[in-house]
Interface confidence: medium
């Protein structure tokens, strides 16, 4: 039950996170005009990954797309790439995790396959979240650098009569959305990985080991009697795993996943 809850919650958290990453990527407010200690202008500038906008005092907004690809800063291209990779990985992770959900039955899919898919989607969510966090952080770093550069220019370039007040940009709403969304996707991924451990079948069956006594040709299967008499774990639909020989006591001390059902 706990495994199902962890897996389901991981899926939902990741879903919200990926929706947030998509929203952040599409948002225009990655950087917004810094209004603090600046002359009050009749227009407000803000920029996204794909276009820049100008909002007039009347509320009328005009946006222009970045129609050039080669003319854009390499950092902006890198941020775009990171966000897109994050979205793609997250989307694939979501698709995989849907089939991995314990509450969804697809044919005779074995629990081990579900466990593998849960782990795969978890890793994908983790990488997706990291990509989003990295992308947003790179952009934020770029803003901080440009902010202080333009601040220095504002105070050094005032020798003449004419002042050219540079438009300084600060963190926009999309950065915070991106950080939170990336964090949620990361948390969701970790939860999926944790759920995977609970989903993985316990190694209660072992490969047959032949013991040849002189003059006899008898194969002895350790634990075989226990499995067949129904005292141990239910072996239905379970693969026989290679594992180190364990004593009867050791086997009993590890509860199987079916003890939680």
């Amino acid at each position: 039950m706990a495994v199902t809850a962890c897996q389901g919650l991981g899926f939902v958290v990741s879903l919200i996170g990926i929706a947030g990453i998509i929203a952040a990527t599409c948002m225009d407010q990655w950087s917004t005009q810094d209004l603090y200690n600046n002359p009050v202008t009749a227009v407000f500038n803000y920029q996204g990954l794909w276009r820049s906008c100008v909002r007039e005092s009347s509320g009328f907004t005009e946006c222009r797309g970045y129609f050039t690809l080669l003319g854009l800063p390499a950092m902006l291209q890198a941020v775009r790439a990171l966000m897109i990779v994050g979205i793609v990985l997250g989307a694939i992770g979501l698709l995989v995790s849907i089939f991995a959900l314990k509450c969804i039955r697809i044919g005779s899919m074995e629990d081990s396959a579900k466990a593998n898919m849960t782990l795969t989607s978890g890793i994908m969510f983790i990488v997706s979240g990291l990509c989003a966090i990295a992308g947003v952080s790179v952009f934020a770093n770029m803003l901080v650098t440009n902010f202080w550069m333009s601040t220095a220019n504002m105070y050094t370039g005032m020798g003449g009569m004419v002042q050219t007040v540079q438009t300084r940009y600060t963190f926009g709403a999309a950065l915070f959305v991106g950080w939170v969304a990336g964090g949620l996707t990361l948390i969701g991924g970790v939860m999926m990985c944790i759920a995977c451990r609970g989903l993985a079948p316990e190694e209660t069956n072992y490969k047959a080991v032949s013991y040849h006594a002189s003059g006899h040709s008898v194969a002895y299967k350790p634990g075989g009697f226990k499995a067949s008499t129904g005292f141990g774990s239910n072996t239905k639909n379970k693969k026989i795993y290679d594992g180190g020989a364990r004593t009867e006591d050791e086997v009993q001390s590890y509860p199987s996943k079916h003890d939680y059902v």
Partner: antibody
């Protein structure tokens, strides 16, 4: 068509307050901003302040403490209130409509204000 | 506040002549966001309210004759009338339409010889 009409007291005594109304037609105050501008006799134009469609206001920094701009969207009226009037406040007072893109595209005919005892 | 300086304060011309007046601002009126210069030119004839001629420094308002041309960027702007007509005699004002408070230039008076 777009029209703006200013109406004021005409004559005000020094240190008194002024209230001028700008009644607009042909457009909605919820869509466009309105600015107030004055012009002393034989002199240039001086911007007083603006009230935008969303209600945000900006004022001339030299007159900020004496000025107040408000509006009544339902009556299509914009009000200019100014206190502690002096003789140098004698001027023609205009209200003008801002386009979406902010420039002043339509002006009223103006109302004359004389500050005299 | 942004100071708008217009020159000359008055111009005496003959009909058909080309005339250029200047407007300088103490701060750049160029918005980096859309690369537009927020400077507007107005014409005021005696006894009338001002009328818009040019916005964004160079965009002619609809209905304005094409003999009126605005140019310039940043802090230096100019208004050119290619062939002055009698009806062009008026006072021309430039307006900083970018920084609050909005500020007008002192005006350039265009007179006939």
């Amino acid at each position: 068509q777009v029209q703006l009409k200013e109406s004021g007291p005409g004559l005000v005594a020094p240190s008194q307050s002024l209230s001028i109304t700008c009644t607009v037609s042909g457009f909605s105050l919820t869509d466009y901003g309105v600015s107030w501008i004055r012009q002393p006799p034989g002199k240039g134009l001086e911007w007083l302040g603006v009230i935008w469609n969303r209600g945000n206001t900006y004022y001339n920094s030299a007159l900020k403490s004496r000025l107040s701009i408000s509006k009544d969207n339902s009556k299509s009226q914009v009000f200019l209130r100014m206190n502690s009037l002096q003789t140098d406040d004698t001027a023609m007072y205009y209200c003008a409509k801002h386009d979406f893109l902010r420039f002043l595209d339509y002006w009223g005919q103006g109302t004359t204000l004389t500050v005299s005892s | 506040d942004v100071v708008m300086t217009q020159s000359p304060s008055s111009l005496t011309v003959t009909a058909g002549e080309k005339v250029t007046m200047s407007c300088k601002s103490s701060q750049s009126l160029l918005n980096s966001g859309n690369q537009k210069n927020y400077l507007t030119w107005y014409q005021q004839k005696p006894g009338q309210p001002p009328k818009i001629l040019i916005y964004w420094a160079s965009t002619r308002e609809s209905g304005v004759p094409d003999r009126f041309t605005g140019s310039g960027s940043g802090t230096d702007f100019s208004l050119t009338i290619t062939s002055v007509q009698a009806e062009d005699l008026a006072v021309y004002y430039c307006l900083n339409d970018y920084y609050y408070p909005l500020t007008f230039g002192a005006g350039t008076k265009l007179e006939l010889k």
